[in-house]
Interface confidence: low
């Protein structure tokens, strides 16, 4: 006769492991007992359980409550056992020894492999700011047995680097994602993808990128200087910028205080009916926690009466 078993039995942490051992004998042969032992190299064989044809199942105190026979119906030539709730320490070599009558004793070995699915964690790098060079955006670490695979899924351009640390029964893998921060990356997802044979599907952890920036400031409203004449109503200057965090705006006049009647409404400077008093240099100051920007414009309010007077003088001079 001969023993039928598996070279390797693979289970996920916490699952039940079936350790197969079936004696395929000639007609009339009987199995008297099946002994299961832990048979790791460098250690003496530690008995796990013994199935006796008359006295039933015996379990070592070290495995009490964790070793069972498969549910009925049972074949008397089947010496398989169930190891409940496999833990990482169960991983290793096992030996099945079958005592038969009249053929004698047979033995076979198998390896139990316990997969430990990873529990990944994602940690963001330092605050991202536009203008930085290559910067750590996030690192993702996963520990398991065997070593998990850690990759990144994102539309953001960047570089990855991985390192692995081997422990006695597992391995930790850390992957870092570096990028050169730009404002276009704001709000973009950066997803760590962890693959492992103990997982039914990849584990994905998403981090949303936040990149601080402040765009150059500019002022709109002076495109047509001829509109800035005495008496004009509804004249306004608007400061243009954008940033993350969203910026605040402040208006000042370089050559003195803001004239009375001029209204500041966030990014907009509203003027009452224009007079020559409104001529001057106006500064828009844009700032957020990241940076600040200034933009200044010169307002020159035209007085038609002054202009016509000048023209008359010129004519008379000729």
């Amino acid at each position: 006769g001969e023993l039928e078993t598996s070279d390797v039995v693979t289970v996920v942490l916490g699952q039940d492991a079936k350790l197969p051992c079936f004696y395929r004998g000639d007609s009339g042969e009987q199995v008297g007992q099946v002994a299961w032992a832990r048979a790791d190299a460098g250690e003496g064989a530690q008995e796990l359980a013994l199935l006796h044809s008359k006295y039933g199942l015996h379990v070592s105190p070290a495995y009490e409550g964790r070793v069972e026979q498969p549910p009925p119906p049972r074949n008397p030539l089947d010496g398989s056992v169930l190891l409940r709730n496999a833990v990482q320490a169960d991983e290793g070599e096992y030996e099945c020894r079958v005592s038969t009558f009249p053929a004698g004793s047979f033995q076979a070995r198998l390896r139990l492999r316990v997969l430990v699915p990873p529990l990944p964690s994602l940690n963001p790098g330092p605050a991202l700011e536009e203008g930085q060079g290559l910067t750590l955006a996030a690192s993702c670490t996963a520990e398991g047995s065997p070593a998990p695979s850690v990759t990144w899924d994102t539309e953001v351009k960047g570089t990855t680097s991985s390192r692995s640390f081997k422990h006695s029964r597992s391995a930790a893998v850390t992957s870092e994602f570096h990028l050169v921060p730009s404002r276009s990356m704001n709000g973009q997802p950066l997803t760590c993808v962890v693959s492992h044979p103990g997982l039914l599907q990849d584990q994905r952890i998403t981090h949303i990128l936040h990149v601080s920036f402040l765009a150059e400031a500019s002022v709109r409203g002076l495109e047509d200087q001829n509109l800035w004449h005495v008496g004009r109503e509804g004249a306004m200057l608007k400061c243009l910028s954008e940033g993350q965090p969203p910026p605040s705006y402040n208006w000042t006049r370089l050559d003195g205080p803001l004239p009375s009647g001029v209204r500041v409404d966030g990014d907009t400077l509203g003027f009452p009916p224009l007079t020559t008093e409104h001529s001057g240099i106006y500064v828009c100051h844009v700032s957020n926690e990241f940076s600040s920007r200034d933009s200044q414009v010169t307002v020159d309010v035209l007085d038609p009466q002054e202009d016509s007077g000048k023209q008359v003088d010129l004519v008379s001079a000729s």
């Epitope: 990944p120 964690s121 994602l122 996030a138 952890i205 949303i208």
Partner: nanobody, 122 residues
Framework: QVQLVESGGGLVQPGGSLRLSCAAS????????MGWYRQAPGKQRELVAT???????NYADSVKGRFTISRDNANNTVYLQMNTLKPEDTAVYYC????????????????WGQGTLVTVSS
């Protein structure tokens, strides 16, 4: 690992109401912030509202006064009551959650649900 399952989406007329629910399961002992994002066709995903375990809330300007987020910590469930719905609220709504790690350190691990579609149309 945390699993998030949304429900309550559907078709509603402008001005109508819907209530979305999101139940968390799995490794949920340390869920910190829960909330909702949405993504309209052809647009980027945007924050709608979030709520801490202590009940502090955050709303996008576009939904303030119309949407109300609430949370049942005992059942690890977050709700989004949406009133006075507008066509521009049409989007896939995603539940999100993060967790507190050991020693109370915030882990920026963000978990997402599969999304539930809200369509506002007459």
């Amino acid at each position: 690992q945390v699993q998030l399952v949304e429900s309550g989406g559907g078709l509603v007329q402008p001005g109508g109401s819907l209530r979305l629910s999101c139940a968390a399961s799995g490794s949920i002992f340390s869920i910190n912030v829960m909330g909702w994002y949405r993504q309209a066709p052809g647009k980027q995903r945007e924050l709608v509202a979030t709520i801490t375990s202590g009940g502090s809330v955050n709303y996008a300007d576009s939904v303030k006064g119309r949407f109300t987020i609430s949370r049942d910590n005992a059942n690890n469930t977050v709700y989004l009551q949406m009133n006075t719905l507008k066509p521009e609220d049409t989007a896939v709504y995603y539940c999100t959650a993060d967790q507190l790690g050991p020693l109370g350190l915030l882990s920026p691990t963000i978990y997402w649900g599969q999304g539930t579609l809200v369509t506002v149309s007459s």
